[in-house]
Interface confidence: medium
C-alpha cells in the first residue's frame, strides 16, 4: 500500500492509473467503502462522503487513463485509506495528514518559551525535527519546546515530520519581540546633550503598549522613574516626566530620549521597560551613562568620570602630543603643577578612546580656559 503524507490546510492529489489509455469508469472510496467520487461517461459524480465539497478530479486526464483524487483544504480526519476502483482492480493509498502549530502566539517576548504541537492521525508514530533560523536543531514527538528564546530565534523555523520513510515539511514564522541591544553605554563630556536610542528588533503593523525608564544614578541611594510613556500605533506620547532631569522624547519609533545636559549627578544606569498590549511580560533594555569632567583648581589639574565603567578602562591625563603624565585604572586622575598647554583627559579601553575632554592650562599668571 502506498503512503502519502499531507499537510493540514494543504491540497493532496492521489493518483490512480488504468492500463487502458482512455476514459473508463472509476470510483474513489474510503476505507468504509463510502463513495467519494467517480465518473459516469464524461460526468463527474460525487458520493455522500464528508469530503464532498473538497474532493475533485482532473477530468482532462481521464482520456489518458489517469483518474486522480484531489482533496483540498486537508483536515487531520481526512487521514484514511483511499481505494481507487478501475478495470476490476483496486489501488489503495494511505493518506496521513499532519498539522504543526505554535501553541501560543507566534510573536513571543525574548526569554519566553516556544512550544510547537504536532497534530497527527491516530495510529501514526511520527518523529519531528525542527531547525531554528540560527541553525539549532531540536527533535521531539508530539510536542517540541524551546525555552529562553533569543533574538536570533526570530525568522522561519523549518520542521520536518517523518513517517513511514516519507517526510512533510512545515515552515513557521516566529517573531521574537526584543530590543536590538540588551544593553548600551553612552559616554559624554559634562554639559553635552545626551541621546538615548532604543531600536526594536522587529516590525509589526500596529504597536501599542506603555513604557517607563527607571534610573539609578551612581550618586543616588535609590532608583527613580525618569519618564513614563504610551505607545499607540507606533506613535509615542509622554505621560509623565521628572522635572530634574527634564527628558524629551521623540514622537515616532525608534524610541528616542534626549537629556539636555550630561551632568555628574545623572551618571548611572537605567532600565527601559516596554509592556506590549496583549503580551505578558515586558521588553527590557539597559542603558548606561558615563560623564567626564576635567577641571583645574589652583595648582591641581583633575579628570574625573562618573557612571558604570568597567575596571579595565584606563583614565589618562596628557599634554597634547606628549606621553601621558598619568594613566590609571581609576575614576579620577590628577596632575599637580601642570605645564601650560592643551591637556587631554582620555578614557580608553585597550587603546580605543571612548571619551575625551580637553582643557587649556595657561601660564600661572592667567586663569584656565575650558574650550
Amino acid at each position: 500500500k502506498k503512503v502519502v503524507l499531507g499537510k493540514k490546510g494543504d491540497t493532496v492529489e492521489l493518483t490512480c492509473t488504468a492500463s487502458q489509455k482512455k476514459s473508463i469508469q472509476f470510483h474513489w472510496k474510503n476505507s468504509n467503502q463510502i463513495k467519494i467520487l467517480g465518473n459516469q461517461g464524461s460526468f463527474l459524480t460525487k458520493g455522500p462522503s464528508k469530503l464532498n465539497d473538497r474532493a475533485d478530479s482532473r477530468r482532462s486526464l481521464w482520456d489518458q487513463g489517469n483518474f486522480p483524487l484531489i482533496i483540498k483544504n486537508l483536515k487531520i480526519e481526512d487521514s484514511d485509506t483511499y481505494i481507487c476502483e478501475v478495470e476490476d482492480q483496486k489501488e489503495e493509498v494511505q493518506l496521513l495528514v499532519f498539522g504543526l502549530t505554535a501553541n501560543s502566539d507566534t510573536h513571543l517576548l525574548q526569554g519566553q518559551s516556544l512550544t510547537l504541537t504536532l497534530e497527527s492521525p491516530p495510529g501514526s508514530s511520527p518523529s519531528v525535527q525542527c531547525r531554528s533560523p540560527r541553525g539549532k536543531n531540536i527533535q521531539g514527538g508530539k510536542t517540541l519546546s524551546v525555552s529562553q528564546l533569543e533574538l536570533q530565534d526570530s525568522g522561519t523555523w523549518t520542521c520536518t515530520v517523518l513517517q513511514n520513510q516519507k517526510k512533510v515539511e512545515f515552515k513557521i514564522d516566529i517573531v521574537v519581540l526584543a530590543f536590538q541591544k540588551a544593553s548600551s553605554i553612552v559616554y559624554k563630556k559634562e554639559g553635552e546633550q545626551v541621546e538615548f536610542s532604543f531600536p526594536l528588533a522587529f516590525t509589526v503593523e500596529k504597536l501599542t503598549g506603555s513604557g517607563e525608564l527607571w534610573w539609578q544614578a551612581e550618586r543616588a541611594s535609590s532608583s527613580k522613574s525618569w519618564i513614563t510613556f504610551d505607545l499607540k500605533n507606533k506613535e509615542v506620547s509622554v505621560k509623565r516626566v521628572t522635572q530634574d532631569p527634564k527628558l524629551q522624547m521623540g514622537k515616532k519609533l525608534p524610541l528616542h530620549l534626549t537629556l539636555p545636559q550630561a551632568l555628574p549627578q545623572y551618571a548611572g544606569s537605567g532600565n527601559l521597560t516596554l509592556a506590549l498590549e496583549a503580551k505578558t511580560g515586558k521588553l527590557h533594555q539597559e542603558v548606561n551613562l558615563v560623564v567626564m569632567r576635567a577641571t583645574q583648581l589652583q595648582k591641581n589639574l583633575t579628570c574625573e568620570v562618573w557612571g558604570p565603567t568597567s575596571p579595565k578602562l584606563m583614565l589618562s591625563l596628557k599634554l597634547e602630543n606628549k606621553e601621558a603624565k598619568v594613566s590609571k585604572r581609576e575614576k579620577a586622575v590628577w596632575v599637580l603643577n601642570p605645564e601650560a598647554g592643551m591637556w587631554q583627559c582620555l578614557l580608553s579601553d585597550s587603546g580605543q578612546v571612548l571619551l575625551e575632554s580637553n582643557i587649556k592650562v595657561l601660564p600661572t599668571w592667567s586663569t584656565p580656559v575650558q574650550p
Epitope: K7, T11, V12, L44, P68
Partner: antibody
Amino acid sequence: QVQLVQSGAEVKKPGSSVKVSCKASGGTFSNYAISWVRQAPGQGLEWMGIITPSGGSTTYAHKFQGRVTITADESTSTAYMELSSLRSEDTAVYYCARDTAGHFDIWGQGTLVTVSS
Amino acid sequence: DIVMTQSPDSLAVSLGERATINCKSSQSVLSSSNNKNYLAWYQQKPGQPPKLLIYWASTRESGVPDRFSGSGSGTDFTLTISSLQAEDVAVYYCQQYYGSPLTFGPGTKVDIK
C-alpha cells in the same frame, strides 16, 4: 510560500536532447502535480505534459508523445522535463508550473532553450 | 483538441477605463456534474512567467485586485478589467482544463491609449 526554481539557459544542437529541472521549496512537493508549458519567442503558451510526483503518474500532449519525458525526484523535490530529437522550432522558454486541478497557480521563472547548429 | 480563440488580438484603453477580452472554446468546457466551467485566465508581462488571475471562469485568485473579473459559461467567456491601471499592461491568455491536452488561447495584448 511555494517557489519553483528552474535550471539555467541551455544552447543545444539539432538532434540532441535537453533536460530542464524545476526545484520546489516551501511546500509539500509530492502532493501537487507539476505541468510543463513552453513558449516560443513572441508566441503563445503550449502545454507539454504533467506529472504527479507522489505516484509518478504522467500524461503528455499528443504533439510531444515519444519525444518528451517528465520525471520527478521526491527526495530533492525536483521535477525534470527532457525533450529529445531537438529541432530549431523547439527554441522556447520552458516553464514548470504547479498544476491545481488543471490551472497553474505557481510558475517557475522559465528556462530558455536555444536549438541552433 | 479543444481550440481556444481570443478577441481582439490587441486593444488600447485609457487609464481608468474598462478593458474587455473575449475567449471562445471550440467545445463546451462546462461540466454538468459540478456546474463548473474549466477555464482560467492568466496575465503575462515581458520577461516574466504568466500569473494566474481567474480560475473556474469567475473565481479570482487570492491577491489579485478586484478590478479583474471573469464571466461566461459553456463556450464564451470574458475577462474584464474595470479600471485599467498602468501595471495592467500585459498579454492576457485564457486556458481550458476540461480536456487533454490543456490548451491556451493565442493571447490578447493590452496597452494604454
